[in-house]
């Protein structure tokens, strides 16, 4: 006879999986809030800053009620991938001024990467359709000046904060429906 069968594979509780994703998202939200505050102290923002290459905010708080789990996770993953790419770009091309935000910017990048892996795992555990491979994104142009890099940093951290805030609310709401 062959080897004894292994223990039956326990299907993870989706609520527990979502809990752990919420915790990671909330932790990253706090990191982003604190880093954005540090940036504002070092380089005060003169008004709101936008970056055309950033994703538009996925959902207003008022529209959360209509959310469905696959759509939320797919959209969140796509948006966070874009923010990860922008943070990497900022660290690489942001200029010497933004070096004062290290190692925090590096920590943020690592945690963003970890959250993306957690979302991927959650989608596979919940047997959700896997999104197609990401098409290669066009390279981001380097900032035109040191202040261009700082303005981009304000836009990236501000947008990431809004996205993560939306994500925490959305994930908590979805958890009540599981």
């Amino acid at each position: 006879p062959g080897p004894p069968p292994g223990p039956p594979r326990v299907s993870p509780d989706p609520r527990a999986e979502l809990d752990s994703t919420v915790l990671l998202t909330r932790s990253l939200l706090a990191d982003t809030r604190q880093l954005a505050a540090q940036l504002r102290d070092k380089f005060p923002a003169d008004g709101d800053h936008n970056l055309d290459s950033l994703p538009t905010l996925a959902m207003s708080a008022g529209a959360l009620g209509a959310l469905q789990l696959p759509g939320v996770l797919t959209r969140l993953r796509a948006d966070l991938l874009s923010y990860l790419r922008h943070v990497q770009w900022l660290r690489r091309a942001g200029g010497s001024s933004l070096k004062t935000l290290e190692p925090e910017l590096g920590t943020l990048q690592a945690r963003l990467d970890r959250l993306l892996r957690r979302l991927q795992l959650l989608m596979s555990r919940l047997a959700l359709p896997q999104p197609p491979p990401d098409p290669p994104a066009p390279p981001l142009a380097p900032p035109s000046s040191a202040w261009g890099g700082i303005r981009a940093a304000h836009a990236i951290l501000g947008g990431l904060h809004l996205t993560l805030d939306w994500a925490v609310r959305g994930l908590l709401l979805l958890k009540t429906r599981l």
């Epitope: 909330r26 932790s27 706090a30 604190q34 540090q38 504002r40 102290d41 070092k42 908590l172």
Partner: antibody, heavy 120, light 108 residues
């Protein structure tokens, strides 16, 4: 040794104003975010306001928003709380507190507190 | 707003006994943002534990913290006379920063 000393408390009538100060020493004041926390007589702790080292990010509790203003003068190693339109429910001991680091690790250092009494 | 609920409101124990204080959080929070304070009458609060389980500087090893998600615990392994005080938990992950209502630890 880190030291925080509050002053400026006292008796004020409802609708009146008061300005609290917190003198800091024993650390590089300009490197740390600062908080005000209050405690009504016989009650628990309530966070009031927070200001980052460079004063560019400020948060308030909803109960004081629009009435209280937190500020700081890094050259004087001082933190302030301007309190306007005071109400009876603002009666409390007001503490200034320093964050442990820029990434939240709690209110690591506290002053001894200054009592504000709002009464007619 | 994240609400913290402490239990019991009052805990009556004798020196040498073990004390277990609970803090229940209305929302999931990462453990690194949950802190515990001790306050004695007429004194300012003192940070005991930060990040749910890290002992603050100068705090005796009989104090320990644990927990994750929504349920956190402060344990005093063997009570000393100076440990009788009010204990508060606090979250720093979300603005407004909030405290629990406190647990009064009194001598039996």
């Amino acid at each position: 040794e880190v030291q925080l000393v509050e002053s400026g408390g006292g008796l004020v009538q409802p609708g009146g104003s008061l300005r609290l100060s917190c003198a800091a020493s024993g650390f590089t004041f300009s490197s740390f975010g600062m908080h005000w926390v209050r405690q009504a007589p016989g009650k628990g702790l309530e966070w009031v306001a927070y200001i980052t080292p460079g004063s560019n990010t400020i948060y308030y509790a909803d109960t004081v928003k629009g009435r209280f203003t937190i500020s700081r003068d890094n050259a004087k190693n001082s933190l302030y709380l301007q309190m306007n339109s005071l109400r009876a429910e603002d009666t409390a001991v007001y503490y200034c507190a320093r964050e442990y680091s820029s990434y939240d690790e709690g209110f690591a250092y506290w002053g001894q507190g200054t009592l504000v009494t709002v009464s007619s | 707003e994240i609400v913290l609920t402490q239990s019991p409101a009052t805990l009556s124990l004798s020196p040498g006994e073990r004390a277990t204080l609970s803090c229940s959080v209305s929302d999931l929070i990462p453990s690194q943002y949950l802190h515990w304070y001790q306050q004695k009458p007429g004194q300012a609060p003192r940070l005991l534990i930060y990040g749910a389980s890290n002992l603050a500087s100068g705090i005796p090893a009989r104090f320990s913290g644990s927990g994750s998600g929504t349920d956190f615990t402060l344990t005093i392994s063997s009570l000393e006379p100076e440990d009788f005080a009010v204990y508060y938990c606090q979250q720093g992950v979300d603005v407004p920063f909030t405290f629990g209502q406190g647990t009064k630890l009194e001598i039996k």
